[in-house]
């Protein structure tokens, strides 16, 4: 299954399949995760070692048992792959680093005004991996301001050194926020030229692609069909480059598909799997274990469920069935793909589903009326969980913010619902950033059950907390997915890193904003808070947030929305916004509901028909 | 030229049987895979059946199974359609087709055959 | 099986019009979908395959997008030839399905 969890202080010894460098824990975890053979990874800050060749390496480690022995060494961070973790699993990284430079090869250097305007600048250039940015107190005056894009052979530093005054991080492409767009078209019967950067053996030219987009120096294929003339060539997927970025040469040629890497487009990517089953097909590879099933769907699923297979194939042939069962290869190689596609066969093979972003159709959990004033514009798939709840009556307007928790789940106060409980006049937006993008084309959500916390009493500010069941299950995209949830009276965690985001007032008399809003606001002790709110009770079951001298707070339409915590590099969903004096006052913080109180109820409902919990824990 | 060429449709009682062939040329026949559509008077595409290149992996349409069986010949370049126990809703224009290698779509087409059951 | 569901069934149009017709298929199928034009007692053409790739000799004024459930077939201005009935067809699962098709008629 998907585990979470960080240790601190510890490093597996052995099991190494890669090394890199990489500049925090979550990045090297992001490497392993999409590596195919990692499932545990060790890292070293700068901080844990005196050997500057070992500084911020991050070494990718597999096992045959899955897990390795761990020994203690002060500052190392480990942990798993994220692979079989669903929506958590993502290649767009948008941390900025202080203080480090990621080296490189340097191909070209501009003047930029701030670190974003770097980032940006290495999102929309096609060969850009990484960057440097000189600030404007760096020690020498001729290199301030300067952005330097880079890129290396595996699309990481090929080193990180600690550098005053210099910030770094990675291109937002794998975010799905390029600017440059992408060619979605596939040309048959033509070959493309320039400088293969990898070979793999693939069944179809989709899979090609898509190994393309996700392969770090990957901008187009040509992929040879089954019926290629030269038969030791027949289903290989070259991954090319170009100084250019796009192919300088094509050529006719039978059987041949190419295409483009995805990474440029904007909005959407591929999911980093491939789901199609190829019947008639047999993949060959290392043999991992051999398992009697019935179908090939469940041998896709046995597959997917043991996290080191990478590929199967499901026989059809009379001496590898007993009664319905029949041999389920269950296979791998290094490189994530067949080593051998052999076609007329009895067989039907497919590949594993554990990097597939969609996961099951759970919820999230780990397991260790009121807008934003004072906050600032959010940006593009910075908080995809978070949902518009509007109402349509003769006009259509934003009423309160939900968090997405799940396909088909969103979680929100109880008092949105104040008379308005008809779930056929509320229209629920995910995946926006702009109010005023919603046009009567926006695709939307409909409501096909609210359940309101049965203790919930109009006009009380307790248990303001209710779901909402969709009609239909969304799709996780980098722009829609969901928060995970806190684990059952989680008291013990000290979140120092919180935001409340919405579309609420930015004052306490304004107006619902059009862009969404965030701001990072502390969280304050119930005693701190029940001495601001005498006259109310401020309960176990609440917890509040805000800052001592005002100016940062929820407000009206902020209602609903989430306020989400990162503890050790994973958003977590602590609060509903509920309640508050007026918005952003002194001494007065913005109470919510505190969501880890409430787990038990929201695993109760959200059950399925079938008794099956729609949770998942990924640790 | 690939060139695709059904034949073998005509009038059949409901019960009745009668296999439809498909004779393909302008392409080596044993690297794709083929397929039936067929197409009721005034209605929309159906698929039918689809069989792997070397014939070893058939799959049928659930309004077929169990009474259409698909096969080739890869040395006579020829795909059939075997049809048992035919139905009033068999009746259709016939077409076999080609799938292209690597992208699944179907790139080449015969004319197809008329296939009526009646009594 | 998959369903595949295309809208509207029917559209009446004119020359020189900008048309699209939808498809959405009942689970995610990535980008394998291909559309196909067919005139009456003629087999089916080829149009866009892989989504919205063009198959070689079809006019640049056809046009395909979309992936996972929700596609598009565009005829950015129709002309007197384009009149006919469009099928999608999902290749995701080897139980190939189609829409129902959308037939365009003149107005």
């Known amino acids: 299954g998907c585990l979470t969890q960080l240790y601190e202080n510890a490093f597996f010894r052995g099991g190494d399949v890669a090394s890199m460098y990489t500049p925090n824990a979550q990045y090297c975890q992001m490497r392993c995760t999409f590596h195919p053979r990692c499932l545990l990874f060790s890292f070293l800050p700068a901080s844990s070692i005196n050997d500057m060749e070992k500084r911020f390496g991050c070494f990718l480690k597999d096992s045959v048992t899955g897990t390795l022995p761990k020994v203690h060494r002060t500052g190392a961070v480990s942990g798993h792959s994220l692979k079989q973790c669903g929506h958590q699993i993502s290649a767009c990284h948008r941390d900025i680093y202080k203080g480090v430079d990621m080296r490189g090869v340097n191909f070209n250097v501009s003047k930029v005004s701030s670190v974003e305007e770097c980032q940006k600048r290495c999102t929309s250039n096609i060969r850009c991996q990484f960057f440097s940015y000189a600030t404007q107190t760096f020690h020498k005056a001729e290199y301030r301001n300067n952005c330097l894009l880079k890129y290396s052979p595996g699309g990481t530093p090929t080193a990180i050194k600690v550098l005053s005054n210099v910030e770094s991080g990675f291109s937002l492409k794998p975010c799905a926020l390029s600017e440059i767009g992408c060619h979605m078209n596939i040309f048959q019967h033509l070959a493309f030229s320039d400088v293969d950067v990898a070979r793999v053996l693939t069944p179809d030219a989709f899979v090609c692609r898509t190994i393309c987009t996700y392969h770090p120096n990957c901008l187009f294929f040509t992929f040879y069909t089954n019926v290629w003339k030269i038969e030791s060539q027949r289903n290989v997927c070259l991954l090319k480059t170009s100084e250019s970025g796009t192919p300088s040469s094509s050529t006719p040629q039978e059987n041949t598909i190419s295409g483009y890497s995805l990474l440029t487009c904007k909005r959407t990517l591929p999911e980093p799997c491939h789901s199609k089953i190829y019947p008639g097909v047999d993949f060959g590879g290392e043999e991992l274990n051999v398992t009697f099933v019935k179908g090939v769907n469940v041998c896709q699923e046995t597959c997917t469920k043991m996290i080191r297979c990478q590929f199967f194939t499901y026989s059809l042939l009379p001496e590898d069935c007993k009664e319905e069962k029949c041999k389920c290869f269950l296979r791998l190689s290094m490189d994530g793909s067949p080593t051998r596609i052999a076609y007329g066969t009895q067989g039907s093979s497919g590949y594993s589903l554990r990097l597939c972003n969609t996961g099951d159709n759970s919820v999230c959990t780990t397991k260790t009326s009121t807008r934003i004033v004072g906050g600032t514009n959010s940006s593009w798939g910075e908080w995809p969980w978070q949902v518009s709840l509007q109402v349509k009556l003769t006009a259509q307007r934003h009423l309160c913010g939900g968090s997405l928790i799940g396909h088909q789940w969103v979680l929100t106060a109880a008092h949105c619902f104040d008379g308005l409980p008809l779930q056929d006049v509320w229209r629920i937006y995910s995946g926006i950033l702009n109010l005023s993008d919603i046009t009567k084309d926006t695709p939307f959500s409909q409501i096909k059950e609210i359940i309101i916390h049965q203790n919930y009493k109009v006009s009380e500010g307790n248990h303001d907390i209710a779901l909402i069941k969709l009609q239909a299950p969304l799709n996780y995209t980098e722009f829609q997915k969901p928060i995970c949830l806190p684990s059952k009276g989680d008291t013990s965690t000290i979140y120092t890193n919180c935001w409340v985001t919405g579309w609420g007032f930015s004052k306490e008399k304004g107006e619902i904003q059009n862009i969404l809003q965030k701001v990072n606001i502390p969280l304050v002790t119930n005693e701190e808070c029940q001495k601001r709110y005498q006259d109310y009770k401020i309960t176990q079951r609440m917890v509040c947030a805000g800052y001592k001298e005002g100016g940062k707070d929820a407000c009206k339409g902020d209602s609903g929305g989430p306020l989400v915590c990162k503890h050790n590099g994973m958003w977590r969903l602590v609060g509903i916004t509920s309640w508050g004096e007026g918005c952003a006052r002194r001494e007065q913080p913005g109470v919510y509901t505190k969501v880890a109180e409430y787990m038990d109820w929201i695993l109760e409902k959200t059950q399925s028909s079938d008794g099956k919990a729609q949770m998942q824990s990924p640790a | 030229e690939v060139q695709l060429l059904e034949s073998g449709g005509g009038l059949v009682q409901p019960g009745g049987s009668l296999r439809l062939s498909c004779a393909a040329s302008?392409?080596?026949?044993?690297?794709?895979?083929m397929m039936w559509v067929r197409q009721a008077p005034g209605k929309g595409l159906e698929w039918v059946s689809v069989?792997?290149?070397?014939?070893?992996?058939?799959a049928y349409a659930d309004s077929v199974k169990g009474r259409f069986t698909i096969s080739r010949d890869n040395s006579k370049n020829t795909l059939y359609l075997q049809m048992n126990s035919l139905r009033a809703e068999d009746t259709a224009v016939y077409y076999c087709?080609?799938?292209?290698?690597?992208?699944?779509?179907?790139?080449?087409w015969g004319q197809g055959t008329l296939v009526t059951v009646s009594s | 099986d998959i369903q595949m569901t295309q809208s509207p069934s029917s559209l009446s149009a004119s020359v020189g019009d900008r048309v699209t017709i939808t498809c959405r298929a009942s689970?995610?199928?990535?980008?394998?979908l291909n559309w196909y034009q067919q005139k009456p007692g003629k087999a089916p053409k080829l149009l866009i395959y892989?989504?919205?790739s063009l198959q070689s000799g079809v006019p640049s004024r056809f046009s395909g997008s979309g992936s996972g459930t929700d596609f598009t077939l565009t005829i950015s201005s129709l002309q007197p030839e384009d009149f006919a009935t469009y099928y999608c067809?999902?290749?995701?699962?080897?139980?190939?399905?189609f829409g129902q098709g959308t037939k365009l008629e003149i107005k």
């Open positions: 892989a989504a919205s």
């Open positions: 087709a080609r799938e292209s290698s690597g992208l699944y779509y179907f790139d080449y």
């Open positions: 689970q995610s199928i990535s980008s394998y």
């Open positions: 069989i792997s290149s070397s014939g070893g992996n058939t």
């Open positions: 067809q999902q290749s995701y699962s080897t139980r190939y399905t």
């Open positions: 302008g392409f080596t026949f044993s690297g794709y895979d």
